[in-house]
Amino acid sequence: APVPPGEDSKDVAAPHRQPLTSSERIDKQIRYILDGISALRKETCNKSNMCESSKEALAENNLNLPKMAEKDGCFQSGFNEETCLVKIITGLLEFEVYLEYLQNRFESSEEQARAVQMSTKVLIQFLQKKAKNLDAITTPDPTTNASLLTKLQAQNQWLQDMTTHLILRSFKEFLQSSLRALRQM
């Protein structure tokens, strides 16, 4: 399911409960995706010892995964709501190709991988409604994404395992940073 249970606007099972605000819905959606990532990481960590490796040991990779930096305005120091929101949406859009790569990379958690992908699409929609400055958001080029996907899928097994681990870890860190920032807005 792309949305946490009870989040569908058609859900009237609890009429006494106040409908979630836009911020609460985004917060819950991120936590739902993080739970999904946690389940996927369990499977990858059971298969290899990469999860125990330090970040430095895994730093040498040619993946250009989105990462929060001071200039993005999402940290406590230098916080800027609008700049940060643009970064979060842009980063999530950039992660989409990597989430596509994750499909078919899991045996027992195939549905979970799909749920993470679909939930991220929903999250992007929620955030786009919140953003005022949509013009500043750059969408990745589909042709570039397609060739990147082909390149990633052509790697040997060990590199594919490494790539899967790095994507999950980076996506988790990006979402955690995003959640911390959104809770300050």
Epitope: L34, S54, A69, R183
Partner: antibody, heavy 118, light 109 residues
Framework: CQSLEESGGRLVTPGTPLTLTCTAS????????VTWVRQAPGKGLEWIGI?????ETAYATSAIGRFTISKTSTTVDLKMTSLTAADTATYFC??????????????WGQGTLVTVSS | IQMTQSPSSLSASVGDRVTITCQAS??????LSWYQQKPGKAPKLLIY???TLASGVPSRFSGSGSGTDFTLTISSLQPDDFATYYC????????????FGGGTKVEIK
């Protein structure tokens, strides 16, 4: 066995800068969030700040501008400036396993005592 | 976000049921932890996510609550449980004075 150890605590005069170091044994700090907490004699726990990745930090309102947290793969430093007698406390570092979104501190050092007195 | 703990101290006997409460100034979902601290020692994580027992913690400890109101319960107080207990919100560590509550000292009656 995994553990944390704080060092650098000592007697200093007011205004003297001081750096405390948190050192990990049995694991790499790069995979975890690290927080600093202090406790004045006979008082409760006071949260100071946290370092997430290599460059994202958050600080308590009272610590902003005076305290700075930085990180390497094996250590986390707490740099303190403009110290006063009110900063006299035992300083603890603690680890957050960073697996979830909420902050919780599941491994603590034994603390290092900082005394600020003229 | 401010955390208010009560009572600040209480006296109880071995075998008693003890309840400590913690209130957040705004909703923190279930993102609350409880710690136990003994004199001269570092705090120890007891409960996280309001109700999940940390590894190795006896089942006589339990936590409940969500939103702004939380409770730590010791079902049958043991000699080893006389200590100070702290709640800590993990919802947001930005622009806060303290993540911890003021503490509750559990003393022998």
């Amino acid at each position: 066995c995994q553990s944390l150890e704080e060092s650098g605590g000592r007697l200093v005069t007011p205004g003297t800068p001081l750096t405390l170091t948190c050192t990990a044994s049995g694991f790499s700090l790069s995979n975890y969030y690290v927080t600093w907490v202090r406790q004045a004699p006979g008082k409760g726990l006071e949260w100071i700040g946290i370092i997430y990745g290599s460059d994202e930090t958050a600080y308590a309102t009272s610590a902003i501008g005076r305290f700075t947290i930085s990180k390497t793969s094996t250590t986390v430093d707490l740099k303190m400036t403009s110290l006063t007698a009110a900063d006299t406390a035992t300083y603890f570092c603690a680890r957050d396993d960073s697996s979830d979104w909420d902050a919780k501190f599941n491994l603590w050092g034994q603390g290092t005592l900082v005394t600020v007195s003229s | 976000i401010q955390m208010t703990q009560s009572p600040s101290s209480l006296s109880a006997s071995v075998g008693d049921r003890v309840t400590i409460t913690c209130q957040a100034s705004q909703s923190i979902n279930n993102e609350l932890s409880w710690y136990q601290q003994k004199p001269g020692k570092a705090p120890k994580l007891l409960i996280y996510r309001a109700s999940t027992l940390a590894s190795g913690v006896p089942s006589r400890f339990s936590g409940s609550g969500s939103g702004t109101d939380f409770t730590l319960t010791i079902s049958s107080l043991q000699p080893d449980d006389f200590a100070t207990y702290y709640c800590q919100q993990g919802y947001s560590l930005r622009n806060i004075d303290n993540a911890f509550g003021g503490g509750t000292k559990v003393e022998i009656k």
